[in-house]
């Protein structure tokens, strides 16, 4: 990066740059005097100006490095700032395309698959369809769904074997958690929509939502992409 | 190939009720939401009413809401739409539609059914 | 409610004409656009979903870009068979919608 653009983007007057000193700028009258004074002087000048070089060289990289950090610095904070409304302690990111809901990174389809499709998805993605904890994380969900004709797979499903819906992870519905609205019979699948969560048919084509787990993030300045 | 075939139109009375149907074919009818759309003589297209595939949940135009009623029976494969409270603005030809649930569009439909509401 | 208002109206073209239609909504709907072809006493047929994905069996001539507010279907080569009615609809949000038709009529 030039200097120039370090100065446009910190902005930084350009005057105060290392252009202001430079070998051009020193006395010419230092340079004269009698022949061995002039071998003399010849030489300390030409110690002096390798001694400005050096000292404007080495400042020229100082400055360059202090503005280098300062970039830098600048880029931390406004990512801190841009993360701390969301984030817990321990400097937790979502990917690129994610929405963070509390220890979660959820990510909201725009196309349509059956729940067997939507469930291999998430997995591509390293992820797993929505497993929801209790009413409260439920509610905070539906907050994200911006109209109410529109329906999303969760990692929910009828287990024909068992007779009961079972989450994706193993473990059985909670009937206090969710209050499901249809049949719980074989090749049913659960949705949720703004105000509802739905038995529907898993062969139904809907959207789906996919969660990532949120970690600490160790020694990382910008979010994953 | 899915097919549509909507029946139970006719000339009704104001304030009179009419129920319309709707058979599907040629496809796994519970795994689509469906809908009905209307178009008054000589005019555009105007979305009425859609259900999800299982007929859990079911969604209205204001202008019809509290007056009409979109159902349907999976294992008849048939949809339907009870229609009550009918004013001279309801007449139209009303077509069912498959689909309807954001984002999906209206892919197959049926004829129409006329339905006039006139004193 | 999303408005979707189409023009022109009623334009008149030739068979071979390149004929383009425009659908412009009241806020950004993304690419959440479908496009009907509709004929006189019959019903609507879907031809392009998603702003610019082409229905099975519809042929290639019809094609739709945009997104955001502002769409276009485009004609490359009118064909006799293509005089009729088209509709923009939005499916971002409900209601669902419709542009009021754009009738293409044989100049």
């Known amino acids: 990066m030039d200097q120039q653009a370090i100065y446009a983007e910190l902005n930084l007057p350009t005057d105060s740059g290392p252009e202001s000193s430079s070998p051009s700028s020193l006395p010419r009258d230092v340079c004269q005097g009698s022949p061995w004074h002039q071998f003399a002087l010849k030489l300390s000048c030409a110690g002096i100006i390798l001694l400005v070089l050096v000292v404007t060289g080495l400042s020229v990289s100082v400055t360059s490095l202090i503005q280098k950090s300062s970039i830098e610095k600048c880029s931390v904070d406004i990512q801190q700032s841009r993360n701390k409304t969301t984030e817990r302690p321990g400097l937790l990111n979502c990917p690129i395309y994610w929405q963070q809901l509390r220890e979660k990174c959820l990510l909201f389809s725009h196309t349509v698959n059956p729940w067997n499709n939507s469930l291999a998805d998430c997995s591509t993605k390293e992820s797993s369809l929505l497993l929801i904890r209790d009413k409260d994380e439920l509610i905070h969900t539906q907050n994200l769904i911006r109209d109410k004709a529109i329906l999303f797979w969760i990692g929910l499903n009828f287990s024909l074997s068992e007779k009961n819906w079972k989450w994706i992870n193993g473990s059985f519905l909670n009937s206090n958690d969710l209050e499901i609205r249809g049949d719980a019979k074989e090749n049913s699948c659960i949705s949720i929509s703004q105000t509802s969560v739905y038995s529907e048919y898993c062969s139904t084509e809907i959207r789906w939502i996919c969660q990532k787990e949120l970690t600490p993030v160790r020694n990382k300045v910008y979010p994953d992409s | 190939e899915v097919q549509l075939v909507e029946s139970g139109g006719g000339l009704v009375q104001p304030g009179g009720s009419l129920r319309l149907s709707c058979a599907a074919s040629?496809?796994?009818?519970?795994?689509?939401?469906m809908s009905w759309v209307r178009q008054a003589p000589g005019k555009g297209l105007e979305w009425v009413s859609t259900i999800s595939g299982s007929g859990g949940s079911t969604y209205y135009a204001d202008s019809v809401k509290g007056r009409f009623t979109i159902s349907r029976d999976n294992s008849r494969n048939t949809l339907y739409l009870q229609m009550n409270s009918l004013r001279a603005e309801d007449t139209a030809v009303y077509y069912c539609?498959?689909?309807?649930?954001?984002?999906?569009?209206?892919?197959?439909w049926g004829q129409g059914t006329l339905v006039t509401v006139s004193s | 409610d999303i408005q979707m208002t189409q023009s022109p109206s009623s334009p008149s073209a030739s068979v071979g004409d390149r004929v383009t239609i425009t659908c412009r909504a009241s806020q950004s709907i993304s690419s959440y656009l479908n496009w009907y072809q509709q004929k006189p006493g019959k019903a609507p047929k879907l031809l392009i979903y998603a702003a610019s994905s082409l229905l099975s069996g519809v042929p290639s001539r019809f094609s739709g870009s945009g997104s955001g507010t502002d769409f276009t279907l485009t004609i490359s080569s009118l064909q006799p068979e293509d005089f009729a009615t088209y509709y923009c609809?939005?499916?971002?949000?409900?209601?669902?919608?419709f542009g009021q038709g754009t009738k293409v009529e044989i100049k």
């Open positions: 539609a498959r689909g309807g649930l954001i984002p999906s569009g209206f892919d197959y």
């Open positions: 609809q939005q499916t971002y949000s409900t209601p669902l919608t």
């Open positions: 040629g496809s796994t009818f519970s795994s689509y939401a």
